[in-house]
């Protein structure tokens, strides 16, 4: 009779390399008496006998993985036990080998010049594939701007026009090579002004041609603005060559003005804009103008930024030591006073105060401020802010305000020029043009004035996009 013998594994498990979808077999030869019970584990988890992905034969000595998957890699162990002595164990690794596979291929990309572009290329494979990129017909070289990331993705910093083209990624290991489909990188370029219009000082009645050249991808469109409004007279000629647009505005000069060239192009849902301005002043213009102590310049402050036309020149009164600062403080103080007024009144009052303290300016030989048109002042006083204005005047009469209306730097409407007499001699408030079309209920006006004085504002001569600050609740 045979003597009992503890199990001995005569053929230890070895590392097995297998390709995906192929068969992989581990052999665990055991000598023992009586016959041992052999169990198998993967990563220390028991493999169940009835798992159809495996075949266990030869009394458990042969484990076959019928169709290897990527997730099958790990440490496989056989454990033999027959009750004599201790159980014995042998382990080996399964290394799943895999041809390169691109799991997340690159896609077509539109990107704005100067931004960062990332073309994805996520791969699988064992050994881990190396990823390279091809642009057009040539291998892409990495440099300070262009890098292939650890993930395989291509990152291009500060994208340039010359980066545009067709790209594909290549994943390679010892078992083979995979190519992505060709994708297109399109580089869009913000509108940029190449040649700004030049300022002119001319005699009354002269012809002047202002020229503005812009570039961009897609090719920009050019529009012209005169003192904050669309150009109402003059002829425009345009030509396009090699993504460069050239626009020429010919004008007959009867008054000074600030002319702004605006180049715009579209990037998806967004627009990019570039601006350049030129002044046309009239020599000897001062003869018909009253002498004013001040200068014309752009507004640099914060408070009226959303109210004043972006490119407009405004008047700074040099009777103040620091005109910019003094006028900004006045408007800031006024702004705080306006916090208490109604949502109907506040934006109208803001438009009035900003345009009154920072009056549009004609930059002739003698800088001349352009006051607000009387009709717009009255619209604020008797329409938008009727209640507030009356309350303020009432408090002034009762001595609650020492200086009455002068607590706010409010213009005296009756002293302002009428737009019906000379539309070019005063400033409109575009906000009111826009808003009067949208007001369905007017505040009750109990005014001592004859009803004829309640303003009838003209139809707006230009479209005016209301700032979000002007939304009314």
């Amino acid at each position: 009779e045979k003597l009992p013998k503890a199990p001995v594994i005569t053929t230890p498990l070895e590392t097995v390399d297998a390709l995906v979808e192929e068969v992989a077999t581990f052999m665990c030869a055991v000598e023992s008496y009586p016959q041992p019970e052999i169990s198998w584990t993967r990563n220390k988890i028991l493999i169940k006998l009835f798992d159809t992905r495996y075949s266990i034969r030869e009394n458990g000595q042969l484990l076959t993985i019928l169709s290897v998957e990527d997730s099958d890699d790990g440490i496989y162990c056989c454990i033999a036990n027959n009750g004599v002595g201790g159980a014995v164990e042998s382990c080996g690794a399964l290394q799943v080998k895999m041809k390169p596979k691109i799991t997340r291929p690159p896609i077509n990309v539109k990107i704005i010049e100067g931004l960062k572009a990332v073309l994805p290329c996520t791969t699988m494979g064992n050994p881990k594939p190396s990823v390279s990129w091809i642009k057009g017909d040539n291998a892409l070289r990495e440099n300070s701007r262009i890098a292939v990331l650890e993930s395989g993705s291509l990152r291009i910093h500060n994208v340039q026009k010359e980066d545009a083209g067709q790209y594909r990624c290549v994943a390679k290991n010892s078992l083979g090579t995979a190519y992505s489909k060709l994708v297109k990188l399109e580089v869009e370029v913000f509108a940029r002004i190449l040649r700004a219009p030049e300022s002119h000082n001319v005699t009354f009645g002269s012809f002047v041609t202002l020229r503005c050249t812009a570039i961009g991808i897609p090719v920009p469109t050019i529009s012209w603005i005169e003192n904050g409004n669309a150009v109402s007279s003059g002829s425009i000629q345009e030509s396009v060559k090699d993504r460069v647009i050239d626009s020429r505005l010919q004008l007959f000069i009867t008054k000074p003005g600030l002319y702004t060239c605006i180049a715009t192009n579209k990037h998806g849902e967004k627009f990019s804009t570039a601006k350049a301005a030129a002044t046309v002043s009239i020599a000897e213009w001062s003869k018909s103008q009253k002498d004013s102590q001040g200068y014309c310049a752009q507004y640099r402050g914060e408070v009226c930024d959303a109210v004043l036309a972006k490119d407009a020149l405004v008047f700074f009164n040099t009777s103040y030591r620091d005109p910019e600062d003094a006028q900004e403080l006045l408007i800031h103080t006024a702004w705080n006073e306006l916090k208490a007024v109604s949502p109907l009144c506040r934006p109208a009052a803001e438009a009035l105060l900003c345009n009154h303290l920072f009056q549009e300016c004609s930059p002739g030989v003698v800088p001349t401020p352009m006051p607000i048109c009387r009709e717009y002042c009255l619209a604020v006083k008797e329409l938008f802010c009727a209640k507030e204005w009356q309350a303020m005047e009432g408090k002034a009469h009762r001595g609650l305000y020492r200086s009455g209306m002068h607590l706010l730097p409010v213009p005296e409407c009756s002293k302002l020029p009428s737009m019906h007499r000379d539309p070019t001699a005063c400033t409109r408030l575009p906000y009111l043009d826009y808003k009067k079309e949208n007001i369905t209920t007017f505040p009750s006006i109990t005014s001592s004035r004859p009803s004829a004085d309640i303003p009838n504002l003209p139809a707006s001569t230009s479209s005016f996009a209301v700032s979000p600050a002007y939304s009314m609740t």
């Epitope: 002004i193 190449l194 040649r195 700004a196 030049e198 300022s199 990019s272 804009t273 570039a274 601006k275 350049a276 301005a277 030129a278 002044t279 200068y295 014309c296 310049a297 752009q298 640099r300 402050g301 914060e302 930024d305 972006k310 490119d311 020149l313 620091d322 910019e324 600062d325 900004e328 403080l329 800031h332």
Partner: antibody
């Protein structure tokens, strides 16, 4: 005597962060706009950021937008510049400068002595 | 974006007059650019000289004057002194899509 004293500079690795401070004294801090201006070694001056007297708006040079944040604490008479995702090209002496008026933009009439920021691995 | 241009270097004899200019790569410098001028001597922080085209900062000698001439801003030093040897920077306010303050590359002035 009017004084602006910067601090917080030092050596930092690319991608790192620093917070610069500028302590003001000798003037009414909350009456003036402030700016940060930098100067790379051997190079010219470069405006970085500005803030008006009340902190109501902030303005930045295009290349630092989204990475740098200017702020001020008028009670502490201090101006700050929080710098994130630093790059080697941000290496410079950073000056804190006082505006001659309330608004953010305009002439800078007083400057600190600067603090050196070095971005290097 | 427009680049602010300055002469890289200039020289002047003591007592002489020199004009430094500040232009824009595209377009003209106007009062709306509020030209400012700064002086920086080696190892020192900059100091303001001229603001808003032609106003002198307090304590700045009257030999420094600012103007707009043609399509450029100009800083004129009349009766240059040895201590005027320094780097001079002009700065312009710009408004395109956002507000910016842009310095020129600087002019190295040598008083021979």
């Amino acid at each position: 005597e009017l004084q602006l004293v910067e601090s917080g500079g030092g050596l930092v690795q690319p991608g790192g962060s620093l917070r610069l401070s500028c302590a003001a004294s000798g003037f009414t801090f909350d009456d003036y706009g402030m700016s940060w201006v930098r100067q790379a070694p051997g190079k010219g001056l470069e405006w970085v950021s500005a803030i008006p007297w009340n902190g109501g708006s902030t303005y930045y040079k295009e290349s630092v937008k989204g990475r740098f944040t200017i702020s001020r604490d008028n009670a502490k008479k201090t101006l700050y510049l929080q710098m994130n995702s630093l790059k080697s090209e941000d290496t410079a002496v950073y000056y804190c400068a006082k505006r001659s008026g309330r608004i953010a933009f305009g002439a800078l009439d007083a400057w600190g002595q600067g603090t050196l920021v070095t971005v290097s691995s | 974006q427009a680049v602010v241009t300055q002469e890289p270097s200039l020289s002047v004899s003591p007592g002489g007059t020199v004009t430094l200019t500040c232009g824009l790569s595209s377009g003209s410098v106007t009062a709306s650019n509020y030209p400012d001028w700064y002086q920086q001597t080696p190892g020192q922080a900059p100091r303001g000289l001229i603001y808003s085209t032609d106003s002198r900062h307090s304590g700045v000698p009257s030999r420094f004057s600012g103007s707009i001439s043609g399509n450029k801003a100009a800083l004129t030093i009349t009766g240059a002194q040895p201590e005027d040897e320094a780097d001079y920077y002009c700065a312009l306010y710009m408004y395109s899509d956002s507000k910016l303050y842009v310095f020129g590359g600087g002019t190295k002035l040598t008083v021979l």
